[in-house]
Interface confidence: medium
């Protein structure tokens, strides 16, 4: 059901039909669900070809990236957004997510965060989840607005299952990982638990359900006694170095 499909807490309206149906032009990737990309006639868009990672919102990108159209004015209907490198101090910005960690957007410029006068919970944009009555989105803007968490979430470290933006929002022993339509605090993996080995940095973006990384002193390796037909589907577990 593509009506009202959500991406990391954001609703995307007026999606083109999946799998290259009418309106789905080849090359115009639309992220229908966290990690599920429909592009042209291909069922999946993988990262093996080293293309930029398409996104619909900042949370789908790494902590040192933000989501935007590669060229100004290209983010209208059908325009593809990708993860771009964050902007350093004193660079131009339009929102906090564009600035690199430790900075925030003030008067259009990335400035160092001064937590003494700018509490963490207020660093995010003040447009807290207003998609429900966002007329622009309903009018056919194919991409969601950035959503943020209420500031109270930042005052105490998130417990297992609570919504987060990044791992530092979570209590000790937890990381922030994608789950359902948002990101939540999940337990860091223990020895013997199944882990996900990524082919390259950033490929975790294709997972609807992200696992945390392996705990201290552990590495994600192929389970030695796990034999399967294809190498690509071998089970990885957290193992001692």
């Amino acid at each position: 059901t593509l009506n009202s499909v959500l991406i990391n807490s954001n609703a995307i309206k007026n999606l083109p039909p999946p799998l290259g149906g009418a309106g789905g032009q080849p090359g115009s990737a639309v992220s229908v669900a966290p990690g599920v990309l429909y592009e042209g006639g291909n069922k999946y868009q993988t990262l093996d070809n080293y293309q930029p990672y398409p996104c619909a919102e900042d949370e789908e990108c790494g902590s040192d990236e933000y989501c935007s159209s590669p060229s100004r004015g290209a983010a209208g209907v059908g325009g593809v957004q990708i993860c771009l490198a964050c902007r350093k101090r004193r660079k131009r910005c339009m929102r906090h997510a564009m600035c690199c960690p430790g900075n925030y957007c003030k008067n259009g410029i990335c400035m160092p965060s001064d937590h003494s006068h700018f509490p963490r919970g207020e660093i995010e944009e003040s447009i807290i989840e207003n998609l429900g009555n966002d007329h622009n989105a309903a009018a056919g803007d194919g991409y969601p607005r950035r959503t943020t968490l209420t500031s109270k979430i930042y005052h105490t470290k998130g417990q297992e299952g609570s919504v987060c933006l990044r791992s530092s929002d979570c209590a000790a022993g937890l990381c922030c990982a994608r789950h359902f339509w948002s990101k939540i605090c999940k337990p860091v993996l223990k020895e013997g638990q199944v882990c996900t080995k990524h082919k390259r940095k950033g490929s975790h973006g294709l997972e609807i359900f992200q696992r945390c990384y392996c705990g201290e002193g552990l590495a994600c390796r192929i389970q030695k006694d796990h034999h399967q037909a294809s190498n690509s589907s071998r089970l990885h577990t957290c193992q001692r170095h």
Epitope: T1, L6, L131, G132, G161, F180, I208, F209
Partner: antibody
């Protein structure tokens, strides 16, 4: 401890309306997505609807789309399900569930019977 | 509609091990590598037993374990006990971000 208590179920005629409530306690309600799941008598579980932590984003199963509306009031720690144009096939026990690591906590359910 | 297929019933004697299977398609169980399992006693609410295919929430006995191979997920209960008698449901998400449950399996503990 986490507690979810549903209320508002009952007998209603086909085409009628009903509003279910789910009172949450024991956790920071506004930090979690919430869901409704139903179970027809003697049948399996069917996911009905989900709502984001602030309430602005909602998602529905095809079977209830356009008839049911999920909402929440974080100031009251309460989840709602407004059910309109009810049909006989909507007869079920309706559970509210917290969407943490999966549907990690469930209420005891409230029975909705649609019959003439 | 995407469906997850479970056996209608499974039985075992106390102390034995039993396995409940959950078969899906590449767009749900196989594609996402993510399955959860719920236990439901008669007249009670479901309880999460396994998430992420094989992880147990705190408070769940280590007699319960989950695994996945291809498009089939499995729940294994070792050292079967009388209180394990219940209905068990697998669930996952399909490509359209719908939450999908299996039809359920009734576990009977013999004797």
């Amino acid at each position: 401890q986490v507690q979810l208590v549903e209320s508002g179920g009952g007998l209603v005629q086909p085409g009628g309306s009903l509003r279910l409530s789910c009172a949450a306690s024991g956790f920071t309600f506004s930090s979690y997505w919430m869901s409704w799941v139903r179970q027809a008598p003697g049948k399996g579980l069917e996911w009905v609807s989900g709502i984001s932590y602030s309430g602005s984003n909602t998602h529905y199963a095809d079977s209830v789309k356009g008839r049911f509306t999920i909402s929440r009031d974080n100031s009251k720690n309460t989840l709602y399900l407004q059910m309109n144009s009810l049909r006989a096939e909507d007869t079920a026990v309706y559970y509210c569930a917290r969407m943490g690591i999966d549907l990690d906590y469930w209420g005891q359910g409230t029975l909705v019977t649609v019959s003439s | 509609d995407i469906a997850l297929t479970q056996p209608a019933s499974v039985s075992g004697s106390p102390g034995q091990s039993i396995t409940i299977s959950c078969t899906g398609t590449s767009s749900d169980v196989g594609g996402f590598n993510y399955v959860s399992w719920y236990q439901q006693h008669p007249g009670k609410a479901p309880k999460l037993m396994i998430h992420d295919g094989s992880n147990r929430p705190s408070g769940v006995s280590n007699r319960f374990s989950g695994s996945k191979s291809g498009n089939t997920a499995s729940l294994t209960i070792s050292g079967l006990q009388a209180e394990d008698e219940a209905d068990y449901y697998c669930s996952t998400w399909d490509m359209t971000v719908d939450f999908v449950f299996g039809g359920g399996t009734k576990l009977t503990v013999l004797g």
